[in-house]
Structures are given as C-alpha cells and as structure tokens.
Amino acid sequence: DFFRDEAERIMRDSPVIDGHNDLPWQLLDMFNNRLQDERANLTTLAGTHTNIPKLRAGFVGGQFWSVYTPCDTQNKDAVRRTLEQMDVVHRMCRMYPETFLYVTSSAGIRQAFREGKVASLIGVEGGHSIDSSLGVLRALYQLGMRYLTLTHSCNTPWADNWLVDTGDSEPQSQGLSPFGQRVVKELNRLGVLIDLAHVSVATMKATLQLSRAPVIFSHSSAYSVCASRRNVPDDVLRLVKQTDSLVMVNFYNNYISCTNKANLSQVADHLDHIKEVAGARAVGFGGDFDGVPRVPEGLEDVSKYPDLIAELLRRNWTEAEVKGALADNLLRVFEAVEQASNLTQAPEEEPIPLDQLGGSCRTHYGYSS
C-alpha cells in the first residue's frame, strides 16, 4: 500500500538504528559462541528473530548489539562473560564484513550508512558487568562499549533496578549511591551513552538530575500505556524532554499490552504517547529482538520495521518525525554525548568502599593501605 511504499522510500535514505538486540546472547545460548558452527551461519540462521536477510529486509542500518550476562554472574564471572560477549560481537562483524561495520561513534554510524552496512555498536546490558570497578568500566570503553545499562534485573551495589518498584527487590542505593554517581560522571567523561532501561524510577530520576548529557532508554516503553515497571512513567518522560534524551521502544508483548498478546498497532500507541509527552525528538526503537519470548503480531522479527513505520505514517507522523525515530534522534543524542566527553579531564579514581563491595570470593589489595 501507499504507506508501506513510503516507509521503504524513507528507510532507504534513513535506515533504522535499533537500540537493543540480543543476538549475541542467542549465539552463546545456541552455539556457545562458536560462529564457525555451520548452524550458526548468520545468512541462514533459523529460530531467531535476527539474521542477515531479515536485517536487510527490515532496513536495519544500525544496531546496538547487547552484551549481556545474567544477574547470577554478579560477583562471580560477570566480567569474563562480558568480555566473551564483546568478543563474539567483534568476531561476528569480522566474519561478515559485507554486512556489518563495527563502529564506536556517531561518525562511524554515518559511514556505515554510506557503505550500506549495518553499523554495529556494543551496548553492555547491566552494571554488574563492571563489577563495581571504574577501571573495568574504562577497559570496557576501550573494548568498544558505547552504552552501559546501569542495572539489569538486579541491584548493583551502586544502583537500583526496576524490581524495586514492584516490591521484588529491596532498595539499596535510593537511586544512585555516591559510587554510582561517580560511575555516571565517568560515563559522561568517556562519552558513553547512559542507558536507563531496567533501572528503578529513583535511579532514572537521580541519573537524569546528574548527567550533563542526554541519556537513553535502550529498550523501554510507556508506563501510561502499559503499567509495567519496565516502562517509563510520564514524570520521567518530562525529564526526558528537558534533557533531550531518548526512549527506544521495546516490543516485548508484556511491556506493550501488559498481556501475553500484542500487536503492531499497540506498539505505535506507545510511540504516540512518548511523542505526545516528551516530543517527537525523544522517540526511537529498541525492539529487544532475540531477548524476549513473545513479540507483537506484525512485528515477528527484525524484517518488520517498515510495517511499523507505515503505521506511523498512517497516523500522520511527518517524514521528519519518522526519520527522527529511525535514526536522527539517536544520532543527535550520541553526538551530544560525544561532545560532552572530555578525555583530557582527570578520570574518576575513588573506588567503591570495601564494605559496599558484594561477593565473598575477593581479595582486598589496596584497601588496607
């Protein structure tokens, strides 16, 4: 139809940058990260939301690949597993150079667009991946991390997660501890996007009050449309507007309709609501493909983005608003974060207090001096 044709026309010029895709987790889960396993061929990969033909059909021009290690690795092998997941993203990009271009900057994304490749960036999903260490944080930056989700679905010693708001976790940091504040400041200094998906409302607010640059929600939807605590409430959306930040809508059925079933139109309802409260410049896409068990009817995999864009056009979104949601908003935020970075400024050095450091299998070098 007309709107589908228009969507494709727009996306040829302005492909989608998606904020969160868990294909790297699937590569671990299905193949233990053995990309040369013949079943792991990304051109023919079956049983996932994501493969190369689907990315092409969906006009995906940029992807933050999720580097995720589960919460039960906290205080155990979280850092090792984080490094292994970063490695699998790097290897994936090298193995399919005609499809993926590994990039670490907004300029790199634009370069990938020019080359017709999928700009491939690393987002680290969960603050437990840094093991409460600013040194680990800086090392992950050197290895390509360009966003850090402050928590996954567990508290860290320095930030609270969304389950605090459901009553399933106890608040520990009242948003951000003093060390958590240092993490936020260091992310600003490095030029790493701060991701507030999965965090508690108190952590959202504390971070939006502290960060000097815009932040993102890499895969979260609108609480007023579906009252899941993984979604963003309106008072926070107003702070998103003030700070030129970005909410990249998650497609998981239970965060879209608050039931096991959802459809594309209901996803558009979330996009409409965020646009209404925070403005069109605050809207993006973070489908969470390959990270969720149920996706909406009409958004079965990454090939379906043009159908969602067609629905927005049908709802009288302007071409500029659609292009914003596809790519321009994320590029604007990323550029602001890059401009706010200051690698000549002294790095944060004060470590987390020993009594706040979780886990029993630790040495205490440095703390006694």
């Epitope: 607010k205 009050q209 000097r212 640059a213 702070l239 507007k241 003030q242 030129d244 974060v337 706010a340």
Partner: nanobody, 128 residues
Framework: EVQLVESGGGLVEYGGSLRLSCAAS????????IAWFRQAPGKEREVVSC????????DYADSVKGRFTISRDNAKNTVYLQMNSLKPEDTAVYSC?????????????????????WGQGTQVTVSS
C-alpha cells in the same frame, strides 16, 4: 571562569512584584542551564526555578508556580526572574547558578553541588 552578578532585589509589599537579573560578566552563558535558588533565614537553600540553554524550556518549584517566570536573553548574557504576587514567605537571599550541560532544557532536581558557578546573591524582603 564565569562570574555571576545578581541584582534587582529589595523591599516590596505583600502582593508586589520584583524582577531579578543574573548577569555574566565577560563570559557567555550560552552553554549553561541557569537556576535560581533562595535561602531564607534559618532555612536550607532551595531551588526556585531553572531555564535551559535556549530559554525555551524551564521549570518551577511548586511553591512559586504561576507567580514566578524565568527567562533569558543570551545576547545580553542575562537571566531574569520575574516575581509577582510576592508573599512574606518569599523573603530570602536569591542566588543564581550556572551548570554546563549538553542538552537544551533544565532539571529542577539537580543537586546544588552539580552547579559550576554561583553568584553572591541579592536580598528580597516581602513585608506583610
């Protein structure tokens, strides 16, 4: 180094108006969100209002909403606080503060320690 100078304070009757100014001498405020704070005798300093870099986005504490208006003139490097319907409880020393940010709005809840530059303050007294 940004130097902020407040002016416009004074003694005013209940229900009256004042317009405070916060001027930056020899430096630009273009890249700074600006907030007005106040401290009444024996009380902690509290935020009153803030305005983003371009002036298009602002916010207000509940206690002054509908009575106070913040604005800025970047060409003059000055931020204004128009205070109407003043009450005795508005009596305080009013100070402006500047915070370097890379977004266009402002966040009222940002802690005082996150502001980079402060003025000396101007006294506002509202008589009953």
């Amino acid at each position: 180094e940004v130097q902020l100078v407040e002016s416009g304070g004074g003694l005013v009757e209940y229900g009256g108006s004042l317009r405070l100014s916060c001027a930056a001498s020899e430096s630009t405020l273009d890249n700074y969100a600006i907030a007005w704070f106040r401290q009444a005798p024996g009380k902690e300093r509290e935020v009153v209002s803030c305005v983003g870099k371009s002036g298009g986005r602002s916010d207000y504490a509940d206690s002054v909403k509908g009575r106070f208006t913040i604005s800025r003139d970047n060409a003059k490097n000055t931020v204004y606080l128009q205070m109407n319907s003043l009450k005795p409880e508005d009596t305080a020393v009013y100070s402006c503060a500047a915070r370097r940010v890379w977004f266009g709005g402002c966040v009222l809840g940002t802690s005082q320690g996150q502001y980079d530059y402060w003025g000396q303050g101007t006294q506002v007294t509202v008589s009953s």
